[in-house]
């Protein structure tokens, strides 16, 4: 956030940039949390825009019995590996076809025993406040589907009648990692020393990191004709003086008519 300065007072302004603001020859360049000619004002909303999508990664192991292991399978640029990868990916795309969050598989390692396939199942969902539940449900369905296919697609009389056959006992889920996104924590961190006064409110399932000085939210402070300003002790209303009135009170709701004061009478609205 920047405020441009013109004229003789500019040199003076340069030395007075506050809150870590830096002078660029024309104006104070303010850090994220501040704005104003001297970076003296605290912003009332901070962009903590969530990522568009949240990902999860499941580390799985399955044992493929319909392919003979060779040392070439360890070499990811070999024809053996490339063909195995193509078929394994095709097979897994079929297995997980009913899971909207499913993105694909990534083979990390192939080892002996027929072919033990260490791989990641990649999941992704659009960000909503319920993303954890959505991804938790998806990981459960992945477990169910891989358990089912490795139980059903097995060699019978040394014949595999499917794209791939598996060893039922070789299926394991090692680890599940979900990208963490905590808007409340992000909001607190980005608000730094004002963290106690910034809160997260949702609109259309999108989180907004706001202070009570941001209008239009349930926590918004009504300063009436005054101006809401954030300080280290919290949000405060700075009351205005008009041609006819002085305003005071915590929310600038008390108006005193100047003419009455000059006439030694007080009148409150």
């Amino acid at each position: 956030r920047t405020t441009t300065c013109f004229g003789d007072g500019c040199q003076n302004t340069a030395s007075r940039c506050k809150n870590g603001g830096t002078w660029d020859g024309l104006k104070c360049q303010c850090p994220n949390l501040y704005y104003g000619e001297l970076c003296e004002e605290v912003v009332s909303s901070i962009d903590i825009g969530p990522p568009e999508t949240i990902s999860a990664q499941m580390e799985l192991t399955v044992t493929v019995t319909s392919v003979k292991f060779t040392e070439e399978l360890k070499n990811h640029s070999s024809q053996e590996f490339q063909e195995f990868k193509q078929t394994f990916t095709e097979q897994m795309n079929i297995v997980y076809s009913g899971i909207p969050e499913y993105v694909g598989v990534n083979i990390t390692k192939l080892r002996l025993g027929s072919v033990v396939v260490e791989h990641d199942v990649l999941l992704r969902t659009k960000y909503t406040p319920e993303y954890k539940t959505v991804l938790d449900n998806a990981t459960e369905v992945v477990k169910e589907k891989i358990t089912k296919v490795t139980t059903q697609q097995i060699m019978i009389n040394d014949i595999c009648s499917d794209m791939m056959c598996f060893n039922t006992t070789g299926t394991q889920v090692q680890n599940i990692t979900v990208t963490q996104y905590d808007p409340e924590e992000d909001c607190r961190k980005m608000a730094k020393e004002y963290g106690d006064y910034f809160v997260v409110e949702y609109r259309d399932q999108k989180p907004y990191c706001i202070s009570p000085c941001e209008p239009g939210f349930s926590v918004s402070k009504n300063c009436n004709l005054g101006k809401c300003q954030m300080s280290l002790s919290g949000p405060q209303c700075l009351c205005v003086t008009t041609e006819t009135h002085w305003y005071s009170g915590e929310t600038c709701n008390q108006g005193t008519q100047k003419s009455l004061v000059y006439g030694h009478h007080h009148h409150h609205h």
Partner: nanobody, 124 residues
Framework: EVQLVESGGGLVQPGRSLRLSCAAS???????MGWFRQAPGKEREGVAG???????GYADSVKGRFTISRDNAKNSLYLQMNSLRAEDTALYSC???????????????????RGQGTMVTVSS
């Protein structure tokens, strides 16, 4: 990448024989090989399959009439078709599995490489 080219198709009378060949551009030694066919307006079906060690499998409709064989030295696959019937009319294509595939038979999903096919028409 394995390229497969079929030959030997043509017009033949019912009860006669035909031999199809499939030439592979690469080594087929460690691959299951198979023949498929697709009749006009119908789905593709597996006809016959052969494992790298010569174990064969056939669709019920061709058992006793068709014989699949391979010559690894020549990187070739064959299908000997005897006692041909009108219902054998189809586009015949050969296919190769991924390397080191075991437990093969004639089903289509075991194969990742397929040829363009050769047309067999059985008609009097």
């Amino acid at each position: 990448e394995v390229q497969l080219v079929e030959s030997g198709g043509g017009l033949v009378q019912p009860g006669r024989s035909l031999r199809l060949s499939c030439a592979a551009s690469g080594d087929i030694t460690r691959r299951c090989m198979g023949w498929f066919r697709q009749a006009p307006g119908k789905e593709r079906e597996g006809v016959a399959g052969i494992s790298e060690d010569g174990i064969t499998g056939y669709a019920d409709s061709v058992k006793g009439r068709f014989t699949i064989s391979r010559d690894n030295a020549k990187n070739s696959l064959y299908l000997q078709m005897n006692s041909l019937r009108a219902e054998d009319t189809a586009l015949y294509s050969c296919a190769a599995s991924i390397l080191n595939r075991v437990g093969c038979r004639q089903l289509s999903y075991e194969y990742i490489y397929r040829g363009q096919g050769t047309m067999v028409t059985v008609s009097s």
